[in-house]
């Protein structure tokens, strides 16, 4: 059983961006590794937005591997026990505790590269990732608050006389909708169990010299504008246009 479609679904145009699989990383270049890291910064926490379905590489502090005793990645995902991936240099052994997601792995052998990779980022990868490096000089941390981004599907249609509806469907986080010119608007958002948010804005323009209206959708993955001509007769079809 599904749900019936909206009873006033005069859909004029749908616009959706498609992103090819890409990789993103906040890692430093090898040249930036410094022996004086402890004097610069002992702990770094970064908020990192990453688009869904891309690959992400998370890096440890820039400590030379020869100075290493233990590397531990601590992964805290919503509603799950903390997962740890550890590598002990002396015995050249790795150990995992409570780690069930096979898409989160070491980039390569941890004795060669301490970075962590997430292959094909999903909404469930939202969370906190921390690398802890134990060295003779002390412990060094780098943490990432990973925020998974989903591009919303944007639609604009006229559903009644001088009333237009703009929707940003299934985005993460919620998109922001604004109108030019401003009208008498009601905007609402709803949260879905897949972690995305739909924002719907319904606007009415009483002033009859307003003939074309623009819906502007702002989102962390990019902005989008659609415009539509307001028709005097409800139900008459006219295409929304993408800027």
């Amino acid at each position: 059983e599904g749900a019936a479609q909206p009873n006033n679904s005069l859909m004029l145009q749908t616009s959706k961006e498609n992103h090819a699989l890409a990789s993103s990383s906040l890692c430093m270049d090898e040249k930036q590794i410094t022996q004086n890291y402890s004097k610069v910064l002992a702990e770094v926490n970064t908020s990192w937005p990453v688009k869904m379905a891309t690959n992400a590489v998370l890096c440890c502090p820039p400590i030379a591997l020869r100075n290493l005793i233990i590397i531990t990645w601590e992964i805290i995902l919503r509603g799950q026990p903390s997962c740890t991936k550890a590598y002990k240099k002396e015995t050249n052994e790795t150990k995992e505790t409570n780690c069930t997601d096979e898409r989160i792995t070491w980039v390569s052998r941890p004795d060669q590269n301490s970075d962590l990779q997430i292959r094909t980022v999903a909404i469930t990868h939202d969370g906190y990732y921390r690398c802890i490096m134990v060295t003779p000089d002390g412990n060094f941390h780098r943490g990432y608050h990973l925020q998974v981004l989903v591009t919303p599907e944007v639609t604009l249609f006229q559903n009644r006389n001088r009333t237009a509806v703009c929707k940003a469907v299934a985005g993460k986080p919620a998109a922001h909708i604004s109108w030019i010119p401003e009208g008498d608007c009601a905007t609402k958002q709803e949260y879905w169990s897949n972690g995305t948010v739909t924002v719907k804005s319904t606007c009415h323009w009483e002033v009859h010299n307003v003939s074309t209206v623009t819906c502007h959708v702002s989102h962390l993955t990019g902005n989008k504008s659609l415009y539509i001509e307001l028709l005097p007769v409800p139900g008459a079809k006219k295409s929304a246009k993408l800027y």
Epitope: G2, G79, A170, E190, W192, G195
Partner: antibody
Framework: QVQLQQPGAELVKPGAPVKLSCKAS????????MNWVKQRPGRGLEWIGR????????HYNQKFKDKATLTVDKSSSTAYIQLTSLTSEDSAVYYC????????????WGQGTLVTVSA | ENVLTQSPAIMSASPGEKVTMTCSAR?????MHWYQQKSRTSPKLWIY???KLASGVPGRFSGSGSGNSYSLTISSMEAEDVATYYC???????????FGGGTKLEIK
């Protein structure tokens, strides 16, 4: 504060229709969806459908699309559900509930109206 | 439509006892929400986004899970926790809100 007021009970004859009301106060009606949920005695919760008061867009659970019709009167800030051709299977508590805020699901509920279908 | 199956349907616990109830989703979801309904009252949003407690919910409640399996836990049962608990999820394609069948929690 947010309030959704529903009458306590309705007695309806089999085959007859009934229209239940849900009066909203303490918030802007057009900024939220109004949902209706059915609960038969001793049973679980079933989502019937919802209406957007700003433009009367409706969505229905397929199971109830021929049974229920949702409407809204913005001037009185009241949402309605009309149930047709009632049978004993329709005897239940019907709740209105608000969705569409910064919380998922239904953060605010009415007290429910008990509909009893009896000759 | 995603089907949510709760177990057990009925359970009882002594005061101070740890209580765990589960909700299994036929299709994987990223978040699960829970409602508490006491006898002859409206349901209340109790836990949302899998593990966040709604306003006024005691700290002895917690939620966890991922994918197809979620749970609600009470660390130490109290008399006021007697109620029916429903898991809940909403999907936007097609639009549908679904409740689990409920777990009725009684006190010994």
């Amino acid at each position: 504060q947010v309030q959704l007021q529903q009458p306590g009970a309705e007695l309806v004859k089999p085959g007859a229709p009934v229209k239940l009301s849900c009066k909203a106060s303490g918030f802007t009606l057009t900024s939220y969806w109004m949902n209706w949920v059915k609960q038969r005695p001793g049973r679980g919760l079933e989502w019937i459908g919802r209406i957007d008061p700003s433009d009367s867009e409706t969505h229905y659970n397929q199971k109830f699309k021929d049974k229920a019709t949702l409407t809204v009167d913005k001037s009185s800030s009241t949402a309605y559900i009309q149930l047709t051709s009632l049978t004993s299977e329709d005897s239940a508590v019907y709740y209105c509930a608000r969705s569409g805020g910064w919380l998922p699901g239904f953060a605010y509920w009415g007290q429910g109206t008990l509909v009893t279908v009896s000759a | 439509e995603n089907v949510l199956t709760q177990s057990p349907a009925i359970m009882s616990a002594s005061p101070g006892e740890k209580v765990t109830m589960t909700c299994s989703a036929r299709s994987s979801v990223s978040y699960m929400h829970w409602y508490q309904q006491k006898s002859r009252t409206s349901p209340k949003l109790w836990i949302y986004d899998t593990s966040k407690l709604a306003s006024g919910v005691p700290g002895r409640f917690s939620g966890s899970g991922s994918g197809n399996s979620y749970s609600l836990t009470i660390s130490s049962m109290e008399a006021e926790d007697v109620a029916t608990y429903y898991c809940f999820q909403g999907s936007g394609d097609p639009l549908m809100y679904t409740f689990g069948g409920g777990t009725k929690l009684e006190i010994k």
